[in-house]
Interface confidence: medium
Amino acid sequence: DAHKSEVAHRFKDLGEENFKALVLIAFAQYLQQCPFEDHVKLVNEVTEFAKTCVADESAENCDKSLHTLFGDKLCTVATLRETYGEMADCCAKQEPERNECFLQHKDDNPNLPRLVRPEVDVMCTAFHDNEETFLKKYLYEIARRHPYFYAPELLFFAKRYKAAFTECCQAADKAACLLPKLDELRDEGKASSAKQRLKCASLQKFGERAFKAWAVARLSQRFPKAEFAEVSKLVTDLTKVHTECCHGDLLECADDRADLAKYICENQDSISSKLKECCEKPLLEKSHCIAEVENDEMPADLPSLAADFVESKDVCKNYAEAKDVFLGMFLYEYARRHPDYSVVLLLRLAKTYETTLEKCCAAADPHECYAKVFDEFKPLVEEPQNLIKQNCELFEQLGEYKFQNALLVRYTKKVPQVSTPTLVEVSRNLGKVGSKCCKHPEAKRMPCAEDYLSVVLNQLCVLHEKTPVSDRVTKCCTESLVNRRPCFSALEVDETYVPKEFNAETFTFHADICTLSEKERQIKKQTALVELVKHKPKATKEQLKAVMDDFAAFVEKCCKADDKETCFAEEGKKLVAASQAALGL
């Protein structure tokens, strides 16, 4: 569907407000260090230009691609080389290489200050003084810290952010109203960012086929009454949407996502009975709701899969005729029957089936060769089931904080070369699987747990890719997307690791720890725990527990002391000495 002016087309489709918001997100995700004011200026210039193209699509430069227009605009930034170094070299390239170059320079862990939340009254005043600037700043700050955040979903977050301030800044107790809402948005936002980061990694590192396979499995679980042709159509459209967003084509992505939501709602009778409420909502809420909608009920009396995929004498003929369609149908049929399996498990089963057919269809007696293929699935299903059972038991026994600590120790021993902040962040998130998933009944535990772990381990993979330090991490991250979790689970203590030199400064604490929130205090203690394991990788659980218990008592004691700083200095020295003795350092 060719348009004379792509920028005019998108401006008209999306409307001025969404157009400006999406251009701001796009620019902030590319130039993550640029000041807010500079981005606003660029966005305003692009918007004014878009309006001239809406008025006359034949006007000068209106026929240029969005990448050309946006790239040219980004390359006008005066401080590009000083701020971004070699990224400035992108500007010497032509499209599409220039855009690819910008994409390669997106930084998953930009060196930006932590976002500190001002006092509620300060925020409410800023909101009332200039609502538009306040909301733009939110988009800018999230986008630059999360360069792969799903742009149309960020518009939904911004809408909720605005609603929270509109309601709470008029409330009698502003803080009681606002702070829980902001906490919820922050936590949901981090989760949304991480989920989208996995989708982009899947597309960019493993290709469209891998993403489509993931989408077939997930949508078949969610819409088990939909026919394969319907699921295939949704998968094709969803792949286009995410390819666009992950490629920085945010206007096209948002436009296509809206079209997909419209299609789903117009055809909900042939897709799912659970969509009715979602489809009554406005656009941003509708798209979000569809993305999160619960699985529909499975159709009654689905026939056994064995007849078509194992017992039939035509399996190899059918497979040879259209391999990906046949495998897609297998995945669809298996997934719609198994909402109790994780998507990654379903993909492992499909991969096993594919490998078996590749081998057996070249054998003398193919049917005899693949007759027992479903038996090969049993151990693949049991492995995550057993792992989840064991870890949920451990979580229920320890509680979240101590469960996180157990994982910190486990993962530090597996990959001690990884930076301490990354180990703390990833292990804390891995530990959240307990409270997130262990409360669910058996039938929901595996899809909750293993698919969540895939998201968290992808964080480890993208952070490690920026500064690779461990061949074992690289291997688990790059060999197979669906086997990342089993690969990390299978890692034992790294025997090649040379323990880190002891540095007393690492274990020196000050009175400022007493004013930290409980979460920040936990992070301090967990940072110390990782460092301990890096110094003494062979330390036993009992030794580490004893040291950590002493450390907790030390912090509690000194935070109650009259002269906190002196307490931390004197008692700290004793603690370090006692810990060294206990661990044999």
Partner: nanobody, 128 residues
Framework: QLQVVESGGGLVQAGGSLRLSCAAS????????MGWFRQAPEKEREFVAG?????????DYADSVEGRFTISRDNAKNTAYLQMNNLKPEDTAVYYC????????????????????WGHGTQVTVSS
């Protein structure tokens, strides 16, 4: 939504031949059994022929057309065909192509309820 479009109908003398085509809009068409049905004026729609998916697929014919009609499919072109030879006046009807939603290995059903996607039909008139 999967679109189905028939073509190739027309007026033919008794004893003559016609070849009907059925084009599907999606590649996933190859994963389904498909069938031809017909409806003569003042009569119920009836099954004519069916074919299951992929190469070497199972075929099925109504007794009234067995030996005269041949159903085939070209998955590369997302198209199915009905070759009609030795046509009779009683073959006059609107011919509909339909795509099923059964499992891939399933035989093509004769029951209209097992077909989800239907074309608008193409008129075949056989004059005596």
């Amino acid at each position: 939504q999967l679109q189905v479009v028939e073509s190739g109908g027309g007026l033919v003398q008794a004893g003559g031949s016609l070849r009907l085509s059925c084009a599907a809009s999606e590649r996933t068409f190859v994963a389904y059994p498909m069938g031809w049905f017909r409806q003569a004026p003042e009569k119920e729609r009836e099954f004519v022929a069916g074919i299951s998916w992929f190469a070497g697929a199972t075929t099925d014919y109504a007794d009234s057309v067995e030996g005269r009609f041949t159903i085939s499919r070209d998955n590369a072109k997302n198209t199915a065909y009905l070759q009609m030879n030795n046509l009779k006046p009683e073959d006059t009807a609107v011919y509909y192509c339909a795509i099923s939603h059964q499992l891939p290995g399933g035989r093509p059903g004769r029951d209209m309820d097992s077909y989800s996607y239907w074309g608008h039909g193409t008129q075949v008139t056989v004059s005596s």
